[in-house]
């Protein structure tokens, strides 16, 4: 009895998580991604905001830019030119959409310790970057691209047709930024900076979404965004390349679109430079099951780019859409023509293939009933990639090295046994030539970042181990987490269950399902998190479960493509199936089951609540999609086809939340949305609310004025407080 008494006295000094802990970010963790500038050097911003250069081989470090210089222009970010002569300092950050923002840029000359005066950059700039060699600058201002040979030089204007909401040069429009690239930029330097490729997006014919931004003026202003919803007119994209050494000579040269792509509506999906005179473009039909990778060469005599049909590689899916969430990008080998790429093998698992001449003759590099997820780096003798192969847990990520210089190629798991209990979910960041790399472990234990030798894989040092977090958590009663699977009708449903600290299987607990469930997503991951649901388990004694059903990723095409053209059916069914299985486990109070989700999760939670099963007492939808006709073309059509009679209109109509308004009568429903949501428009919730009112169904709602899809800032605190009250009331938990 004695040890358990000691144990109990220890537990008495420990406390549960509070909502305040979560809202204050008390238990947030840090990661360390080196800003690599060579094979053995990286930059990092120190705790006191100096920019420090570290040399791994000499062990030396020195400040290249003082916090005083940073502070003098209120800089929040920086970028060193490859020749190390200049640094750009970024200030006045102003967020636009998910990745895009504008900022003011100052150029600091490291050789004389002064800011560059004369020919200063205009403001605000939409995107700015150094060339890969030297100190040329490319930037986008008012939707046009400019070039500077050196920071103090006058600029050369490359494009002139840029116009707000009409023509975008070098930056994507809304839908390309969110759903296709997905980046804030659409320009790419060639490896030595000789050429600059860029995309031009023409949005002139795209319908505009307009919503009010209330601000604090007498009259609200209207935000207008060209936003193609499913079936609407799409942006027209063109790709140009300009010689930056002599840009006025022939001007921008358009890269031809493959004939089989250009015959109907299409997308540009990515651009990869191979050499200074070879470029690889990826294109996609609007019906996103055919992708073409086109390798183009510079023709010196004509000063044009030639994309021979023999260098077109087609990737097609017959069971779903091309790729996973996006079509994968090629990683070229040193011969500058062959490449490595992830796509589905004959068994329907995404694996690395080596393409030398044609896709048909591709050599499969990895195989098995698991998936290769990302190719990090290809060197002369090694290929580094991540996968979820180890111990058959789809929600893990380990880093592997395949030797490609020897035959047969040998495979080594670099991370599998490093810190096995603590670390099962890794990403990596490689220096030039993979001389060194950083591993960032996200969990399931406290995250840790380490530096490694690229040849021996030996750990050199710990970059960040979150010691303060570890100490802070010592007296916190964290919930228990388990990742397991259910086998139901030949479908494997992986789930994560978050259990109260003193969980007792013989007792009954309220259950909250947290769902996302979107195509090619994964919620059940072996990662560390102290968040709202951790608090609900720790303090409020709830059991929380996350389930990856049909449509989710990294478990093969059968599961992934099951939802093709049928969104809103199997994702919901699988959540319901899992809940029934959880009830069978004996520790769930079946009268106190709730479901909540955000975005796609809000759609699934709404449909689950309206499924008529009687399983759910209550639920919350935050910023839900309510009809696929309201969402972006690129995303929606990838999975649903077109909302036309001769395509898939019927399922578009059948899969709306509004069509199930009657079924909300017997559940408590909390509907939440930001009025300035540029992504999932407020329209979605407005239509749900209208349908519920028309059906005379009672429900609760909360809007967040002028908030976007992220509901950030003070709204976050209000949101989670409000949802907590709602759930506690639903579960009859005292405040």
């Amino acid at each position: 009895l004695r040890p358990s008494r000691v144990h109990n006295s220890e537990e008495n000094t420990m406390r549960a998580l509070t909502l305040k802990d979560i809202l204050n970010g008390t238990f947030s963790y840090k990661t360390f991604f080196p800003n690599w500038i060579s094979g053995q050097e990286y930059l990092h911003q120190s705790a006191d905001n100096n920019i420090v250069l570290y040399n791994i081989e000499t062990g030396q470090s020195y400040t290249i830019l003082s916090n005083r210089t940073m502070k003098s222009v209120n800089a929040s970010n920086y970028g060193l030119s490859p020749d190390r002569q200049f640094v750009y300092l970024e200030s006045d950050y102003s967020k636009l959409w998910r990745y895009s923002y504008t900022a003011t840029y100052y150029i600091y000359d490291l050789s004389n310790g002064e800011f560059v005066r004369g020919n200063e950059l205009p403001r605000p700039i939409q995107y700015l970057c150094w060339s890969p060699v030297g100190s040329k600058l490319a930037y986008v201002y008012q939707n046009n691209i400019y070039l500077k040979q050196r920071p103090g030089d006058p600029p050369f204007q490359i494009t002139f047709n840029g116009r707000e909401n009409k023509i975008f040069n070098g930056i994507p429009d809304w839908v390309y930024e969110e759903e296709m690239l997905p980046t804030k930029y659409a320009l790419w330097w060639s490896p030595n900076g000789k050429f600059l490729a860029y995309a031009e997006f023409n949005d002139k014919d795209i319908p505009v979404i307009a919503y009010s931004y209330y601000g604090d003026e007498q009259y609200p202003r209207t935000i207008n965004i060209p936003y193609p919803k499913a079936g609407a007119k799409n942006p027209v994209v063109r790709i140009f390349i300009i010689d930056t050494t002599y840009p006025a000579y022939v001007g921008p040269q358009e890269v031809p679109v493959p004939a089989m792509i250009a015959s109907s509506d299409y997308y540009f999906s990515w651009l990869t430079w191979v050499t200074d005179e070879r470029v690889c473009l990826q294109w996609l039909k609007r019906v996103q099951n055919v992708s073409v990778l086109s390798i183009c060469d510079f023709r010196e005599d004509w000063q044009t780019w030639d994309c021979p049909k023999t260098q077109e590689h087609i990737e097609e899916s017959r069971t779903g859409w091309a790729g996973g969430f996006f079509v994968s990008r090629p990683v070229f080998s040193y011969d500058a023509i062959s490449y490595y790429k992830i796509f589905s093998d004959k068994d329907g698992y995404k694996h690395i293939h080596y393409i030398k001449d044609t896709v048909e003759n591709a050599i499969q590099i990895t195989s098995g009933k698991w998936e290769a997820i990302n190719i990090f780096r290809v060197t002369q003798d090694s290929l580094f990639y991540s996968s979820n192969e180890f111990e058959e847990y789809p929600g893990r990520r380990n880093i592997y090295r395949i030797s490609i210089g020897s035959y047969p190629p040998s495979k080594k798991c670099v991370t599998c046994h490093l810190r096995k209990e603590r670390c099962q979910y890794y990403t990596a960041s490689f220096s030039d030539y993979a001389k060194y790399y950083a591993l960032v472990c996200y969990g399931p234990g406290i995250p840790i970042s380490t530096l490694h030798d690229g040849r021996t894989d030996q750990e050199i040092k710990i970059l960040e181990e979150n010691k303060e977090l570890e100490n802070a958590l010592k007296n916190i009663q964290l919930p228990k987490e388990e990742i397991k699977k259910l086998e139901v009708d030949e479908i494997t449903l992986w789930y994560k269950m978050i259990l109260p600290p003193q969980f007792d299987r013989s007792k009954k607990y309220p259950l909250l399902i947290q769902v996302y469930g979107g195509p090619c997503s994964q919620s059940v991951r072996s990662v560390f998190a102290v968040n709202w649901i951790s608090y609900l388990a720790s303090k409020e004694g709830m059991v929380i479960a996350l389930v990856d059903g049909r449509g989710t990723a990294f478990q093969g095409d059968k599961l992934l493509y099951a939802v093709y053209r049928k969104l809103g059916v199997y994702e919901v069914e699988d959540q319901i199936t899992a809940v029934r299985k959880f009830i069978e486990m004996g520790f769930i109070d079946e009268k106190r089951i709730a479901i909540w989700g955000w975005s796609y999760g809000g759609y699934v939670s709404s449909l689950a609540l309206a499924s008529g099963t009687g399983l759910f007492k209550c639920g919350i939808a935050v910023a839900p999609v309510s009809s696929w006709e309201y969402y972006a073309s690129v995303y929606t059509e990838r999975f649903m086809g077109l909302p036309t009679k001769d395509d898939n209109l019927e399922h578009y109509k059948n899969s709306t939340v509004m069509a199930r308004a009657e079924y909300f009568r017997n559940v408590d429903y909390l509907l939440i949305h930001g009025t300035a949501d540029d992504n999932v428009h407020f329209q979605n919730s407005a239509q749900i609310a209208k349908a519920l009112v028309n059906a005379q169904v009672d429900f609760q709602a909360m809007w967040y004025s002028d908030q976007n899809h992220g509901l950030s800032g003070l709204s976050t605190n209000h949101l989670y407080t409000h949802m907590t009250h709602f759930l506690k009331q639903c579960f009859s938990l005292s405040d």
Epitope: Q149, R150, D153, Y246
Partner: antibody, heavy 118, light 108 residues
Framework: EVQLLESGGGLVQPGGSLRLSCAAS????????MSWVRQAPGKGLEWVSA????????YYADSVKGRFTISRDNSKNTLYLQMNSLRAEDTAVYYC???????????WGQGTLVTVSS | EIVLTQSPGTLSLSPGERATLSCRAS???????LAWYQQKPGQAPRLLIY???SRATGIPDRFSGSGSGTDFTLTISRLEPEDFAVYYC?????????FGHGTKLEIK
């Protein structure tokens, strides 16, 4: 301060050759394209030839193509123009200039006079 | 090649007056790729304007450029004694780059 100093001009007979040099200072020479522009006595300006910063690309006016060769030595910060098969109409002041983007010229050297006459 | 015609050939004005110099192209100059230079006797040309309207570093704001397509203008808002010189326009929107024959601005 950017400085460009031409040299090598002089009197030469038709059919003869001459090599002009332009010594550059005050800027990162290898980062910029450079050009030669000429001005016949009492006449306007005519672009003659250009070369990229690395020296990898060269460009010529039709009137001198095949006769003139532009080159540079980035280690010496010097630009050259080799002029062969000279004609009377090549008589001009030859200026070297920093060439921005294959567009405008700024600054210019003070020029060197080439006279082709028998 | 694009031929640039400058007018007038000679412009006689007094200090303090406004000068308007014209440059017309035989075909459209793409993207307003046009520059203006000033040349004084015995000196090398000096860049005034690039991109049709952007003033070069150190050029006083009394010099301004405008125009697009085939018609371009250099304006000197208030002539100073040192502004009397020959002015050349130059296009770089198409190869080869070409210059106009110049406008001589002389003191009246």
């Amino acid at each position: 301060e950017v400085q460009l100093l031409e040299s090598g001009g002089g009197l030469v007979q038709p059919g003869g050759s001459l090599r002009l040099s332009c010594a550059a200072s005050g800027f990162t020479f290898s980062s910029y394209a450079m050009s030669w522009v000429r001005q016949a006595p009492g006449k306007g300006l005519e672009w003659v030839s250009a070369i990229s910063g690395s020296g990898g690309s060269t460009y010529y006016a039709d009137s001198v193509k095949g006769r003139f060769t532009i080159s540079r030595d980035n280690s010496k910060n010097t630009l050259y123009l080799q002029m062969n098969s000279l004609r009377a109409e090549d008589t001009a002041v030859y200026y070297c200039a920093k060439d921005y983007y294959g567009g405008w010229f700024d600054p210019w050297g003070q020029g060197t006079l080439v006279t082709v006459s028998s | 090649e694009i031929v640039l015609t400058q007018s007038p050939g000679t412009l006689s004005l007094s200090p303090g007056e406004r000068a308007t110099l014209s440059c017309r192209a035989s075909q459209s100059v793409s993207s307003s790729y046009l520059a203006w230079y000033q040349q004084k006797p015995g000196q090398a040309p000096r860049l005034l304007i690039y991109g049709a309207s952007s003033r070069a570093t150190g050029i006083p704001d009394r010099f301004s450029g405008s125009g697009s397509g085939t018609d371009f203008t250099l304006t000197i808002s208030r002539l100073e004694p040192e502004d009397f010189a020959v002015y050349y326009c130059q296009q770089y929107g198409s190869s080869p780059r070409t210059f106009g024959h110049g406008t001589k601005l002389e003191i009246k």
